[in-house]
């Protein structure tokens, strides 16, 4: 005997109570594949979640986090508090980055400033809580005896006439 359920498309379920007739998914439920014997309950985006995409008969709702929070995990399974740039989230809430570290995002941890000297370079711009240091030429390149030849003129892009 052929399984009639395999003919039921997404958005329906195979109703065993009605001789394997394909019945539409009830309100607030969906089936994303054919041949389903039940429909799944739609996800509700409430509390710290807000709806990014409404549930339909063939696809689940998709949630985002409310303002001030960001998604974590597959399909935004959790919301985590944002912090300001220059901070990181600790068990006691958002805390400023310690000296020598920075965070240029609203999430994640404070990371150490780049150590320019490891690359034989000098610090061109000091780091802050929000920004990494900018490394410049090596100290040797900046010494008075270093060559000071005129840099070559920048090449013009083809098709651009001189100003």
């Amino acid at each position: 005997l052929q399984d009639l359920c395999s003919n039921c498309p997404a958005g329906t379920f195979c109703d065993n109570n009605r001789s394997q007739i394909c019945s539409p998914c009830p309100p607030n439920s969906f089936s994303s594949a054919g041949g389903q014997r039940t429909c799944d309950i739609c996800r509700q985006c409430k509390g710290v979640f807000k709806t990014r995409k409404e549930c339909s008969s063939t696809s689940n709702a998709e949630c985002d986090c409310i303002s001030g929070y960001h998604c974590l995990g597959a399909e935004c399974s959790m919301c985590e508090q944002d912090c300001k740039q220059g901070q990181e989230l600790t068990k006691k809430g958002c805390k400023d980055c310690c000296f020598g570290t920075f965070n240029d995002q609203k999430r994640g941890i404070c990371r150490p400033w780049t150590n320019c000297s490891l690359d034989g370079k000098s610090v061109l711009v000091n780091g802050t809580k929000e920004r990494d240091v900018v490394c410049g030429p090596s100290p040797a390149d900046l010494s008075p005896g270093a060559s000071s030849a005129t840099p070559p003129a920048p090449a013009r892009e083809p098709g651009h006439s001189p100003q």
Epitope: G47, V48, L72, G73, S77, M78, C79, E80, L89, K91
Partner: nanobody, 123 residues
Framework: EVQLVESGGGLVQIGGSLRLSCAAS?????KYWMIWVRQAPEKGLEW???????????YYVDSVEGRFTISRDNANNSLFLQMNSLRAEDTAVYYC????????????????SGQGTRVTVSS
Amino acid sequence: EVQLVESGGGLVQIGGSLRLSCAASGFTFSKYWMIWVRQAPEKGLEWVANINQDGSEKYYVDSVEGRFTISRDNANNSLFLQMNSLRAEDTAVYYCARGGDDYSISHFGMDVSGQGTRVTVSS
């Protein structure tokens, strides 16, 4: 279905006290961190305090440290927030929320919250 239901809010004088409760159902309460957050009028959602699974770790936002105490009763699937020395700036809707378990991506994240209970602190 996971459910969190807050109670215990109300109108209180500055300097007064309130004890909020949160009844949890639909999940294994003792496996999750739990969180209190609040939303003051015209403000965003603010994290207030959280507590780990067995109640041995508790953390508070600086503005409530020493005045608020978070606790839990795993046998009765309940979360509490004892609020003392209340200030006008504590006026908000308070929500309890479920945090992560030992396998979650974050202990600071939350995935379910209740409908909230309103606390009004007036002079």
